[in-house]
Interface confidence: medium
């Protein structure tokens, strides 16, 4: 079943290569187990960036080597992606799945265009 | 009289606060004197960033204290805006006027969204 997911159109990564955005979903039921996946679309290729499952009211748990972190608050998920470089500029799509209890719902946002600018290297300190 | 002006939708300023984009116009006549104005739209306020007049085939002449520089090639103007900070993020609109000889033509582009990220300060060198 389809579900509406909202996310900002554009976000700028900061000079340390960190970008944060909110992914909000219109939950049709009382889900206790939610799965959030971030997909990157570039040059018509879609790749998975990271994924996490969380229990309502708990923190998001990404894998240890994930470039994503996040927190949840109600139907909002605050996602942070780090280690971004200019070449990672692209459309980052938030996919939300209500895993449990049934019925299963899934929604995909329109994507957040994340722009990343590589910083100038600092001069060597002598 | 109206004239079509094209410019890119999005440009990122580099880490030194410099953004460049091309403003292209469809000249209906043989203009010898062309005026280019860059306008910034933010929060429904439109302000003039810089303006220059150029003779076909010559450099653009901005006032000495202008934050803009540019070159022209045929019906294309290559604009560079410098000294940008994160607070300068906004929609930069290219306005082109064919000043002489008559008839006068004017065209306004849809704007280029320029994103600016302030760099992290470098650590002090001891």
């Amino acid at each position: 079943k389809a579900m509406h997911v909202a996310q900002p159109a554009v976000v700028l990564a900061n000079s340390r290569g960190i970008a944060s955005f909110v992914c909000e979903y219109a939950s049709p039921g009382k889900a206790t187990e939610v799965r959030v996946t971030v997909l990157r679309q570039a040059d018509s290729q879609v790749t998975e960036v990271c994924a996490a499952t969380y229990m309502m009211g708990n923190e998001l748990t990404f894998l240890d080597d994930s470039i994503c972190t996040g927190t949840s608050s109600g139907n909002q998920v605050n996602l942070t992606i780090q280690g971004l470089r200019a070449m990672d500029t692209g459309l980052y799509i938030c996919k939300v799945e209500l895993m449990y209890p049934p019925p299963y719902y899934m929604g995909i946002g329109n994507g957040t265009q994340i722009y990343v600018i590589d910083p100038e290297p600092c001069p060597d300190s002598d | 009289k109206a004239m079509h002006v094209a410019q890119p939708a999005v440009v990122l300023a580099n880490s030194r606060g410099i953004a460049s984009f091309v403003c292209e116009y469809a000249s209906p006549g043989k203009a010898t004197e062309v005026r280019v104005t860059v306008l910034r739209q933010a929060d429904s306020q439109v302000t003039e960033v810089c303006a220059a007049t150029y003779m076909m085939g010559n450099e653009l002449t901005f006032l000495d204290d202008s934050i803009c520089t540019g070159t022209s090639s045929g019906n294309q103007v290559n604009l560079t805006i410098q000294g940008l900070r994160a607070m300068d993020t906004g929609l930069y609109i290219c306005k082109v006027e064919l000043m002489y000889p008559p008839p006068y033509y004017m065209g306004i582009g849809n704007g280029t969204q320029i994103y600016v990220i302030d760099p992290e300060p470098c650590p002090d060198s001891d």
Epitope: - | E33, A51, Y104
Partner: antibody, heavy 116, light 108 residues
């Protein structure tokens, strides 16, 4: 046909004031920067002041700053020059000019004489 | 400020002569130079703009050349109506202008 017609000149005592006007026709006045240029008797041309199309940005020759004020009314196709604290050396024919980067269009001029 | 220097300050010539007036800018002004003609009691008239572009309605015997700091106005074959004073003007600092001191062209 493009026409620029100046008015408001005359004889004024040192320290006095005058307001010059320039009525434009035959071109889209609001599209163009406009300027005042003056010429003292038997002398060359001297740029006085210019104003951008919107009327918000104004430029003055150093010797006129603080004494002269340029303005425009695009709805009336008119350019103005308010001259205060006039001096004998301000005696000149004042021309209204414009039409682009170069001064394509000129008025016939109005004579301002500053004398006691 | 950009200074404009014209030479000569006056020149005597005859109908049919070829006359050249020069103008030098104190710094580079690319092609942002105009030439004006002024007759006694009349407003200046734009002859040449952008260093070499002939203003509409100006006879083709008038021509301009130059780039950067050195410019010339040439009248290929003087006509009686050409005796007047000629001014160069820089527009590099547009809309703040500077004029040359003028060159008076007199009948020999």
């Amino acid at each position: 046909e493009v026409q620029l017609v100046e008015s408001g000149g005359g004889l004024v005592q040192p320290g006095g004031s005058l307001r010059l006007s320039c009525a434009a026709s035959g071109f889209t006045f609001s599209n163009y920067e406009m300027s005042w240029v003056r010429q003292a008797p038997g002398k060359g041309l001297e740029w006085v002041s210019s104003i951008r199309t919107s009327g918000t940005t104004k430029y003055y020759a150093d010797s006129m700053k603080g004494r002269f004020t340029i303005s425009r009314d695009n709805a009336k196709n008119s350019l103005y020059l308010q001259m205060n604290s006039l001096r004998a050396e301000d005696t000149a024919v004042y021309y209204c000019a414009g039409g682009g980067t170069f001064l394509h269009y000129w008025g016939q001029g109005t004579l301002v004489t500053v004398s006691s | 400020d950009i200074q404009m220097t014209q030479s000569p300050s006056s020149v005597s010539a005859s109908v049919g002569d070829r006359v050249t007036i020069t103008c030098r800018a104190s710094q580079g002004i690319a092609s942002y130079l105009a030439w004006y003609q002024q007759k006694p009691g009349k407003a200046p008239k734009l002859l040449i703009y952008a260093a070499s572009s002939l203003q509409t309605g100006v006879p083709s015997r008038f021509s301009g050349s130059g780039y950067g700091t050195d410019f010339t106005l040439t009248i290929s074959s003087l006509q009686p109506e050409d005796f007047a004073t000629y001014y160069c003007q820089q527009a590099k600092s547009f809309p703040m202008y500077t004029f040359g001191q003028g060159t008076k062209l007199e009948i020999k």
